[in-house]
């Protein structure tokens, strides 16, 4: 008895697809070896026709595919535009087709049912609308017209010019009598149901000169789309309901196991709290269509998704629906990163976002989760260097470390800044990624004068202090501009006093401005990294004024601890350009700047190696 | 909700046939797939058949045991599922349940399914 099972029937009709779902055990070698579909012939052998080594036959060439499933110990062949050929005897299997483990899978692809002759043929999406058109001649026109539903031998009213309305399609159907000359009449459906499925008649007139037509209504279930997305990873669900709903409420709901659909978001501001952070519903379009995205997706996330239409922003039968099957996959391609960042007040943390490698030249975003409403993420920075105007002097975007990560550096931490934030690309979107920073109790770990006011043509010296925790830290100063930040020389002044409790590996270095121009002016970072990836940073702003009196200036370590002064930026509402966004209603058309906050200087960002789902921890 | 019935269970002889239904209802236009388990005096509840559907396309998956000798089927009009038991053994006396599921990974497991119903006997004398 082979240990692979699959379904041992499958039938379908001409034109559609199916979906092949074959299970082996999962061992190590059976996760590995080669998966494949193959039509048994009359002498026994049976003829590859698609595989996971990537061969499609001609015969399935643009229509078919085999997709492994390694963590659950699956494969699924999907095939589409299937013919009445494609009936046969098919084997799923694992390793060799003649002796491998495998399956034996009957195909059996049909017609579809036999119509009277000249039928005219509807296939409708359940919730949709269908529009009859019933031609009738001129002698008929002043009579009455009806539409019938055949069961069985039986014909049943559904509706008729006299006003009658069948009770089974109250208040979504109506009949329209064109005016003079148009020898035709329709009959209009709405929010079709399952049970609207069959064979209906068209009449005008009566007896023997009566005008008579078939229509064959086939409502189908949405088929789900199989959707597979790798663990925290991003999906987007595009949902295009119709014309017809355009200006009602739309939902994303989740299939649970009552039978029922939970709402994950709605555009009357339902969302479920799982999804909180990293989910966003598109603005809708003209057409009605909008679009949800999901990132930092997790196992329980998969499962059936339906996008819906109905005033109460949830599923109701007989609205029109579209479905999708969600499986994360587990052997996921993006690297793990802190979900969780901490920080604190006053502090600084430094962000790794993952991207796709092979789209190194992309360009990188970083934006601000917002939960109003549908949700959005307007842009606070980008890899171009555009910085929202709040973010001034505390935000930055580096490319390093590179090869699939970069880095946001975001210091002068308030407790506003504690929410979601999102890494993305203007390249593959499944890479975008959600890190949520939250900002604890504790002291920032540099230390750095609130701020200085350097005097034109004298000498500046600005210090930073920073515990012995970061003694094998290389330690940086560099003047930030929108662009990014600019390493500077510093200069390593010793063991520093502000830390008591410290023995020779605290240390002070200090930046040196001499002479200082006007060009000088604006925010220093201090700050710490290992190689390419970055620690803590502190700001500080330095205002140049004119001379007033002869002598070097120089910041003593003393004033080093006093506390920061608040630097308040522009909090106006600003408008980012959402250059090469592939997706760009993804954010909100305006982009809303955020209230800043305070301003404080000083920094602090760590690193606790206790969890890999988070960054941070209070100070030591 | 969803609520199952099962109904056209028996005692036959060994050779004989016998067809169970399975009517849902309620809240039926989200099932993806349903199916028959059983459990015989003693034993655990095992998966007989199931069949699973998109659109017009339906899926049918069997226990080996009963392969060649029962068949699954639905009737889509009236939320019914079918199954037809043909050369019986006296190996097959159980109880029978129907089971529905909204989504289902491996239609062989017990817990993949969200609803149940009552279960009908079925008994096989030699």
């Known amino acids: 008895k082979s240990p692979v099972f699959g379904p041992q029937e499958v039938s379908s009709v001409e034109g559609n697809s199916v979906s092949i779902k074959c299970y082996y055990p999962p061992t190590s070698v059976n996760r590995h070896t080669r998966k494949y579909w193959c039509r048994k012939g009359a002498s026994g052998r049976c003829i590859t026709l698609v595989s996971s080594e990537g061969y499609v036959s001609s015969n399935y060439a643009g229509r078919a595919n085999l997709t492994n499933f390694p963590e659950n110990g699956t494969f699924v062949v999907n095939i589409a535009q299937l013919s009445r050929d494609d009936s046969g005897h098919y084997k799923c299997g694992l390793g060799i087709n003649s002796r491998g483990l495998s399956f034996d899978v009957s195909l059996e692809v049909s017609q579809g049912p036999e119509l009277p002759n000249g039928t005219e043929v509807y296939t409708v999406d359940v919730g949709r609308t269908v529009t009859i058109k019933c031609p009738f001649k001129t002698e008929n026109a002043p009579k009455t017209k009806a539409l019938y539903k055949k069961i069985g031998q039986t014909s049943v009213l559904v509706i008729d010019s006299r006003n009658y309305v069948n009770p089974n399609y109250k208040d979504r159907i109506r009949l329209r009598i064109p005016g003079t000359g148009q020898l035709i009449f329709t009959v209009v459906i709405d929010r079709l149901r399952l049970s609207d499925h069959g064979l209906y008649l068209c009449q005008a007139g009566d007896g023997s000169n009566r005008d008579e037509k078939n229509a064959d209504l086939q409502v189908l279930e949405p088929e789900p789309e199989l959707v597979y997305e790798d663990l925290r990873g991003s999906v987007t669900f595009h949902c295009a309901l119709g014309l017809e709903v355009a200006n009602v409420a739309k939902f994303l709901c989740r299939v649970n196991s009552r039978e029922t659909c939970d709402v994950v978001i709605n555009t009357l501001g339902k969302r479920d709290s799982a999804f909180e952070g990293r989910i966003l519903l598109n603005p809708q379009d003209k057409d009605g269509s909008f679009s949800v995205v999901i990132t930092g997706l997790r196992k329980e996330d998969e499962g059936r998704y339906l996008c819906g239409a109905h005033s109460d922003g949830q599923l109701q039968e007989g609205w029109p629906i579209q479905a999708w099957q969600l499986f994360v996959n587990e052997e996921s391609t993006i690297p793990r990163s802190p979900t969780v960042v901490k920080g604190v007040a006053g502090g600084s943390v430094a962000v790794l976002c993952p991207y796709n490698p092979k789209e190194s030249q992309s360009l990188k975003y970083w934006c601000l989760w917002e939960g109003a409403q549908n949700g959005r993420c307007p842009l606070l920075v980008e890899s171009q260097g555009l910085v929202q105007e709040q973010y001034e002097g505390r935000l930055s975007l580096l490319q390093e470390p590179g090869n699939g990560t970069f880095t946001v550096i975001l210091n002068q931490l308030t407790t506003q800044d504690a929410g979601f934030y999102w890494c993305l690309t203007n390249g593959d979107t499944r890479w975008r990624t959600t890190v949520e920073i939250k900002i604890i109790e504790g002291e920032p770990n540099l230390k750095v004068p609130g701020n200085v006011t350097a005097v034109l043509g004298e000498t500046l010296n600005i210090p930073c202090h920073f515990p012995c925790k970061f003694s094998s830290y290389e330690k940086y100063w560099c003047k930030w501009s929108n662009t990014g930040c600019q390493t500077l020389p510093s200069q390593d002044e010793g063991p520093s006093e502000a830390f008591v409790n410290c023995d020779e590996n605290s240390r002070l270095v200090s930046l040196t401005l001499n002479p200082v121009t006007r060009a000088d002016e604006g925010w220093y970072w201090c700050g710490v990294k290992q190689g390419h990836f970055y620690g803590e940073t502190a700001a500080v702003y330095v205002a140049v004024e004119e001379k007033k009196v002869a002598g070097s200036r120089y910041v003593s370590p003393a004033k080093a601890d006093a506390a920061p002064d608040e630097k308040v930026l522009d909090s106006g509402v600003r408008e980012i350009e959402n250059k090469a966004i592939q997706d760009p209603r993804l954010f909100a058309e305006e982009k809303v700047v955020a209230d800043t906050g305070d301003q404080a200087g000083g920094s602090r960002a760590s690193v606790d190696s206790s969890s890999s789902e988070e960054q941070g921890g209070s100070s030591k | 909700q969803v609520q199952l019935v099962e109904s056209g269970g028996g005692l036959v002889q060994a050779g004989d046939s016998l067809r169970l239904s399975c009517a849902a209802s309620?809240?039926?236009?989200?099932?993806?797939?349903m199916g028959w388990f059983r459990q015989g005096p003693g034993k655990e509840r095992e998966f007989v058949a199931t069949i699973t559907w998109s659109g017009s396309t339906n899926y049918k998956y069997y226990t080996d045991s009963v392969k060649g000798r029962f068949t699954i089927s639905r009737d889509n009009a009236k939320n019914t599922v079918y199954l037809q038991m043909n050369s019986l053994k006296p190996e097959d006396t159980a109880v029978y349940y129907c089971?529905?599921?909204?989504?289902?990974?491996?239609?062989?497991?017990?817990?993949?399914?969200?609803?149940w119903g009552q279960g009908t006997q079925v008994t096989v004398s030699s």
């Open positions: 089971a529905a599921s909204t989504v289902l990974t491996d239609p062989r497991r017990l817990n993949e399914y969200d609803y």
């Open positions: 309620g809240r039926t236009f989200t099932t993806y797939g």
